[in-house]
């Protein structure tokens, strides 16, 4: 057959769906690869063709759209399963073509099983709630397009293995779950089960997300540099190793980039002709406040290096701060006191440091 623009296997879209539940999968061509939508393509006389390769097989085969109760169907640019079966797992291809044009992309579809605590291999989205911040809501995700607005589904919410009822601060409100006030104890996996009728049949949609309670913007502060500080002096002799830690606390801020960096004499360490290494470590509190430590290390420091200015800088969405380290050359104690030796003929006193 004639050439076809093949976008290959789009592993960025690793689609996971639950066994025995409806799934609607849009052809990724129109979402991520082509500059026109399905309606435009359809109007231009292009046809969308679906086929698949079963798991652990190489053979591409057409999708059977003649199954009982139209279990698999196509509607515009959407492939529908009503419902899925475990052996629907495989690589699916949608191809858009006419006599002069052809474009196709494949994507993996994994049908997964869940247990009665909603555990499964499914990758879970994370929703962050601010600690003690007032009413916040999570919404049952990815249920749009499954049923018309005239249908009134039932929605049951669970935390882990338990149906949410009589929880002090968590209230189910249809598609939303309201947290009157969020605490660390609200961390966990929350599942909504949406049940709806369609053409005389009943379907479930199960959606699980992870709730993570994080620091509140009410309590957020600019970065705080704990080290270097005014109480510690880095006093070294030439030839010794100089180690200066820069330890910075960052309040949790949604979508904030936290940065820590050193300057030496106002320049980046890379721009200074000395052998500097910088090692960074990051730790998080339970509410995702962050502590970053960058240790500046000069293996064999020179007297020149000990005269330089070492400044730790930190920046977040809340502001920028800087703190200089106090670095000194250690003054060696004299081997003996010259004045005493000369003036009084005293014995030599050796001071070893």
């Amino acid at each position: 057959s004639e050439r076809c623009d093949d976008w290959g296997l789009d592993t960025m879209r690793q689609i996971q769906v639950f066994e025995d539940e409806p799934a609607r999968i849009k052809c990724p061509l129109f979402e991520h690869f082509l500059k026109f939508n399905y309606s435009t393509a359809h109007s231009a006389g292009l046809t969308l063709i679906w086929y698949w390769t079963r798991q652990d097989r190489d053979l591409e085969e057409p999708i059977n759209f003649r199954l009982p109760e139209n279990r698999i169907s196509k509607e515009k640019d959407v492939l529908w399963f009503r419902p899925t079966l475990l052996n629907d797992t495989g690589n699916y291809t949608c191809m858009l073509r006419n006599t002069t044009y052809c474009s196709k992309v494949a994507f993996p579809l994994e049908v997964v099983q869940k247990d009665s605590c909603f555990n499964s291999p499914m990758k879970l989205p994370v929703h962050k709630l601010y600690i003690e911040y007032g009413i916040q809501r999570i919404t049952c995700p990815n249920v749009d397009g499954y049923f018309p607005s005239s249908v009134k589904p039932t929605i049951t919410w669970y935390m882990g293995c338990y149906k949410i009822q009589n929880f002090n601060n968590v209230i189910p409100e249809g598609m939303n779950l309201s947290f009157l006030i969020a605490f660390i104890s609200n961390n966990g996996n929350y599942t909504c089960v949406v049940t709806y009728p369609e053409n005389g049949r009943t379907f479930h949609l199960t959606r699980t997300l992870t709730v993570k309670v994080v620091g509140s913007p009410k309590n957020a502060v600019p970065p705080v540099i704990h080290s270097p500080n005014d109480h510690v002096v880095y006093e070294k002799e030439p030839g010794e190793e100089l180690l200066i830690p820069c330890t910075v606390y960052f309040s949790f801020l949604m979508d904030s980039r936290n940065e820590v960096w050193w300057t030496i004499d106002g320049k980046k360490p890379d721009d200074i002709p000395i052998d500097v290494t910088i090692n960074e470590s990051i730790s998080h509190s339970r509410t995702e406040d962050e502590t970053r430590t960058q240790i500046l290390s000069i293996k064999k420091v020179t007297s020149e290096d000990l005269k330089r200015s070492y400044v730790c800088h930190a920046r977040s969405a809340k502001g920028e701060v800087a703190k200089a380290a106090t670095v000194k050359q250690k003054v060696p104690a004299p081997r003996y006191t010259v004045e005493l030796a000369c003036g009084f003929g005293a014995t030599h006193h050796h001071h070893h440091h």
Partner: antibody
């Protein structure tokens, strides 16, 4: 095809215990909760409690808390309901039912337990 | 526990009649009410969930309505196979509770 098949009828003496089984087939057993509901002769339905086969957790109707134990054996896909200290008013048909998302869509055929001296 | 009061406890009707059964909850249960049909010697069968949604395979002559505390099951045109006992149940909060049942008999 989803099926819940319960054990046969039982006649018990007051003060004794009964253990009713419910064998599930046609679906993945540990994906659904199993509830137990009873119905005294000519009466309505009465919820006794449920078991979550994954966690092993059971929740009971307080009316039965001290007397009922609901368990599940994942290896045989079987749920059990044990009721102790039986009295004549426990004479009833006992049903197991599979639940998901608040839907009691599949029920066992029922087990008649008669408590009589 | 939430009480579910079902009425009437029994009714006589003819084939083709419109039949209405009501259920009243002692507290707000939202839409979390199911209706079941039970024939003598058989286990209950789910008809309606979420107060108004017909379960798979249930004929369209069965409909449910209501919210909060007042719920109704309607059979628009009674058929011979509909003579049975009907139960409402709240699936809102433990312990789940059921009405006393309504027996629909042939007139």
């Amino acid at each position: 095809e989803v099926q819940l098949v319960q054990s046969g009828a039982e006649v018990k003496k007051p003060g004794s215990s009964v253990k009713v089984s419910c064998k599930a087939s046609g679906y993945t057993f540990n994906s659904y909760w199993i509830h137990w509901v009873r119905q005294a002769p000519g009466q309505g339905l009465e919820w006794m409690g449920y078991n979550n086969p994954t966690s092993g957790y059971s929740e009971y109707n307080q009316k039965f808390t001290d007397r009922v134990t609901i368990t599940a054996d994942k290896s045989t896909s079987t749920a059990y309901m044990e009721l102790s200290s039986l009295r004549s008013e426990d004479t009833a048909v006992y049903y197991c039912a599979r639940e998901y998302g608040d839907l009691f869509a599949y029920w066992g055929q029922g087990t008649l337990v008669t408590v009589s001296s | 526990a939430i009480q579910m009061t079902q009425s009437p406890s029994s009714l006589s009707a003819s084939v083709g009649d419109r039949v209405t059964i009501t259920c009243k909850a002692s507290e707000n249960v939202g839409y979390s009410v199911s209706w079941f049909q039970q024939k003598p010697g058989k286990s209950p069968k789910l008809l309606i969930y979420g107060a108004s949604n017909r379960y798979t395979g249930v004929p369209s002559r069965f409909s449910g309505s209501g919210s909060a505390t007042d719920f109704t099951l309607t059979i628009s045109s009674l058929q011979p196979e509909d003579f049975a006992t009907y139960h409402c149940g709240q699936i809102y909060i433990y312990p789940y509770t059921f009405g006393g049942g309504t027996k629909v008999e042939i007139k």
